[in-house]
Each structure stands twice: as C-alpha cells, then as structure tokens.
C-alpha cells in the first residue's frame, strides 16, 4: 500500500533531502532555509541560493523549512498558574511550566493548568508528585481518599463510595444515633 | 440529540446568592470537562470556570475567584454553578457547555445551552 500524501509532501518528495520543490518550476529544487529563517524568496534558478530571512523579534522557526512567515510565539498562560520557563528565540518557542511543587493538568493537548501537589496529610505518599501527575496518597486508618485528599470517615455519608472503607466508623456512628446521644 | 438546559437565573440584590444548574442529554456527560461562560449586556463572551470529568480539577476567571464554585453530579448529568457575593458587575447572560480549547483563552463550545440571565441589582 502507498500511503497518501498531500501535495507539499508530494511536492517535497521529489528533491532530495533538505531541498523542496520550485512552486512555479517543479525542474528546480531549492534549499530549505534554517531554523531561525523563513522564506522570503524562492530560488530564482538551479544551485542558486533560497532568500531566506531571520525571524522578527516574537516569531520563530524550529526546524529547516519553507515557510512564508515565521509563527508567533506561545505566551504563558497567567490565568492558568503558567510560568515561563525559557523565553522565545528565533529557533525556538516559549517554554511554559509550573513552578516547584506543582503539576500540570491538562485541559487540552496544547492547554493546562498548574495546581499544587498533594501533600497526603492525614496519609502516606504511594506515588510522588510528577510533572503532569498528581501525587498519589494512601489514606491512614479513619480516613477516605476524595479528590485526592484524605477525608476523615466523620464526613462519609453512606450514598458515598467511602462506605466500605469507613465501615466501622458507619456503624458507629449509626450506633449513637439509635441510642439518642448527643 | 444533544441538549443543555440552564435554569437558577434571575434578580438578586449585591452581596447575594444563586445556584445555576445546567441539565445535560444526549451524550455521555460523565466523559468530558465541563465549563460555564457568561455575556454582561455589550460585552464579549468570557470564561467563568471548568470543571473536569472528575470534578477534581477546576478553573476559575480571577473575576470570580473565591466568589463561585462549580461542581457537577454525573449521575444526574448536571452542573451547577454556585455564586455567593454577587456584584453588580456580574449581571450577565451565564451558558454552560462543553467547551474546546483550540484557541484559549477564545470562548469556543461544540455544544452549549440557551442561556440564564443573571441580574444582580438593589
């Protein structure tokens, strides 16, 4: 089976490595231009050299390439906790992450949001902190994990899942109910 | 068919409480985040907050931070919105849906209700 191309990887496929294919002339393959450039002008002919241009301050080009434009760098996502890890050169994007003791949540491929770690109080750590994952916590004896954090069994209500970890302390206090205690 | 239906909307005084639900049919609510938007009369859409699958990760727009809680009940397919410490800036059309994040911090949902008016007004 072949598989389907589009038509730049057509076109592209038919110079060699590094090269692409003329737009208005497809006997003539031009150089690609580095990262940190894009294409200003083709080729005007064979083993004549591509006009390439360096990137505007705000753009970049991460790899060798024959594009018209530069594309615009990614900015930190404030609202989202994001913190700028390294800032946009011309071969390369803006670095986003979160800071110590944090993780990211992702909303989407290309969106996430920082929150904090899960410290386990009132349990043990079972997996530490990763960057894109939360901390996983084992609760102590009394406690039931929710929204990763442990929850004293007091606050079980038995429509809950928490009801065959707390069992004991259901019963308890179902017990003190009947009796009429306060 | 999917539909959303908001409903909790209408006239409160500042300082003020209300509880928005939004209703959700025809696709598996239990699977995806969850968000609600709002429009204050000639202003853009903006985000109020998300809500993931789980109920366990949430975002909140500064705007409202410490004011509103979202939450969800899968089991009923429905999210609410709680707002207590209404101001008059918060009057609004308020939409839940289920939003897509190709273009954050752009409002964008694949589905989303007809709306709740929201009037916060001595």
């Known amino acids: 089976l072949v598989p389907h191309l589009g038509d730049r990887e057509k076109r592209d496929s038919v110079c060699p490595q590094g090269k692409y294919i003329h737009p208005q002339n497809n006997s003539i393959c031009c150089t690609k231009c580095h990262k940190g450039t894009y294409l200003y002008n083709d080729c005007p002919g064979p083993g004549q050299d591509t006009d390439c241009r360096e990137c505007e301050s705000g753009s970049f080009t991460a790899s060798e390439n024959h594009l018209r434009h530069c594309l615009s760098c990614s900015k930190c996502r404030k609202e989202m906790g994001q913190v700028e890890i390294s800032s946009c050169t011309v071969d390369r994007d803006t670095v986003c992450g979160c800071r110590k003791n944090q993780y990211r949540h992702y909303w989407s491929e290309n969106l996430f949001q920082c929150f904090n770690c899960s410290l386990c109080l009132n349990g043990t750590v079972h997996l530490s902190c990763q960057e894109k994952q939360n901390t996983v916590c084992t609760c102590h004896a009394g406690f039931f994990l929710r929204e990763n954090e442990c929850v004293s069994c007091s606050n079980c209500k038995k429509s809950l899942e928490c009801t065959k970890l707390c069992l004991p302390q259901i019963e308890n206090v179902k017990g003190t109910e009947d009796s009429g205690t306060t | 068919e999917v539909q959303l239906l908001e409903s909790g909307g209408g006239l409160v005084q500042p300082g003020g409480s209300l509880r928005l639900s939004c209703a959700a049919s025809?696709?598996?609510?239990?699977?995806?985040?969850m968000g609600w938007v709002r429009q204050a009369p000639g202003k853009g859409l903006e985000w109020v907050s998300l809500?993931?699958?789980?109920?366990?990760?949430?975002y909140y727009a500064d705007s409202v931070k410490g004011r509103f809680t979202i939450s969800r009940n899968n089991s009923k397919n429905t999210l609410y919105l709680q707002m207590n410490s209404l101001r008059a800036e918060d009057t609004a059309v308020y939409y839940c849906?289920?939003?897509?994040?190709?273009?954050?911090?752009?409002?964008?949902?694949?589905?989303w209700g007809q709306g709740t008016v929201v009037t916060v007004s001595s």
């Open positions: 849906g289920k939003p897509v994040f190709s273009d954050w911090p752009a409002v964008e949902f694949d589905y």
């Open positions: 809500i993931d699958p789980s109920g366990g990760h949430t």
């Open positions: 025809g696709f598996t609510f239990a699977r995806y985040n």
